[in-house]
Amino acid sequence: SAPFSFLSNMTYHFIRIIKHEFILNDTLNQTIIRANDQYLTAAAIHNLDEAVKFDMGAYTSSKDDTKVPVILRISKTQLYVSAQDEDQPVLLKEMPEIPKTITGSETNFLFFWETHGTKNYFISVAHPNLFIATKHDNWVCLAKGLPSITDFQILENQA
């Protein structure tokens, strides 16, 4: 399993929700859907209503950093994406409200959001060498890269 991040002793402060109700597609044009209660998967879907809609909340850190730490929440719920270890599915965990500050083990809820053109990457703050990733016939998990897919397209304002 991946070593726990040296960044875990930092404190992150919530700023605001920066994106509402967006959908994530991978480069195989698979869409992230919610499956089996606490897990996410990626599938080619015909009905976009089956896609998970996410909100993205931005945080600042006590260290000046060019990377943007974000939290991912299923829209209109109290369910947040939480990282586990490498090749383990990310979990949906319930919290009564968006955390105002995050530190220590709670950094499992944070991801550095990086963009390169239309490609979006979500790097675990708790495990900085691991990305949110999709894999053929598997769950959305944490992975270093291929054969998992780590780059996503953000589809905003889907009706």
């Epitope: 089996n36 209660d37 599938a43 089956e50 896609a51 809609k53 996410f54 299923i74 719920t77 016939d137």
Partner: antibody
Framework: EIQLVQSGAEVKKPGASVKVSCKAS????????MNWVRQAPGQGLERMGW????????RYADDFKGRVTFTLDTSTSTAYMELSSLRSEDTAVYYC???????????????WGQGTTVTVSS | DIQMTQSPSSLSASVGDRVTITCRAS??????LNWYQQKPGKAPKLLIY???RLKPGVPSRFSGSGSGTDYTFTISSLQPEDIATYFC?????????FGQGTKLEIK
């Protein structure tokens, strides 16, 4: 084509057990949870509970706890519901139904088995 | 548990009529309300999810509306094949309870 095919009708005596199967096809079985819902003659729909087809974890409605067990055979994409200590009030049609979460938040049952009639009679 | 109260429990209408069924939740369910149709001797079939979204393949004469605790299901022009019992179900909070059903008959 997505299909849920259930086992045939059963007649049981009070105190006995019944095991109903539900074979799924047309989708990846482990991705979608499976519900069990029953309907007594002329009555409404009663959700008995749910099984996570990936972990095997089950959740049972309070009215059925201790009498019902959900199991899986992932190699054949089949879910099972076993109800024990049967009584006449358990006479009903039992359905399996697949989970879906629209937008990731609205829980619905989008595909249903054809139903299995269980008659409990002495 | 969230209680779902459906009304009426039965209704009789003529072909071509506009038919309305209501469902009230005991607390706010944030539009997470689904409607099912069950024809005699058949399994229920999902028609509408998220209060107003029509499942692909379902005829457009079926519609849903509402918010908060109060929701409505409408058939704009009743057809003979619509004879069935209709159930609402809240998809907000486990155990995802059903309404008691509305039996629809043709006059």
């Amino acid at each position: 084509e997505i299909q849920l095919v259930q086992s045939g009708a059963e007649v049981k005596k009070p105190g006995a057990s019944v095991k109903v199967s539900c074979k799924a096809s047309g989708y990846t079985f482990k991705y979608y949870g499976m519900n069990w819902v029953r309907q007594a003659p002329g009555q409404g729909l009663e959700r008995m509970g749910w099984i996570n087809t990936y972990t095997g974890e089950s959740r049972y409605a309070d009215d059925f706890k201790g009498r019902v067990t959900f199991t899986l055979d992932t190699s054949t994409s089949t879910a099972y519901m076993e109800l024990s200590s049967l009584r006449s009030e358990d006479t009903a049609v039992y359905y399996c139904a697949r989970d879906i979460y629209y937008f990731g938040s609205d829980y619905a049952m989008d595909y249903w088995g054809q139903g299995t009639t269980v008659t409990v009679s002495s | 548990d969230i209680q779902m109260t459906q009304s009426p429990s039965s209704l009789s209408a003529s072909v071509g009529d506009r038919v309305t069924i209501t469902c009230r939740a005991s607390q706010d369910i944030s539009n997470r309300l689904n409607w099912y149709q069950q024809k005699p001797g058949k399994a229920p079939k999902l028609l509408i999810y998220y209060a107003s979204r029509l499942k692909p393949g379902v005829p457009s004469r079926f519609s849903g509306s509402g918010s908060g605790t109060d929701y409505t299901f409408t058939i704009s022009s009743l057809q003979p094949e619509d004879i069935a019992t209709y159930f609402c179900q809240q998809g907000n909070t486990p155990p995802y309870t059903f309404g008691q059903g509305t039996k629809l008959e043709i006059k």
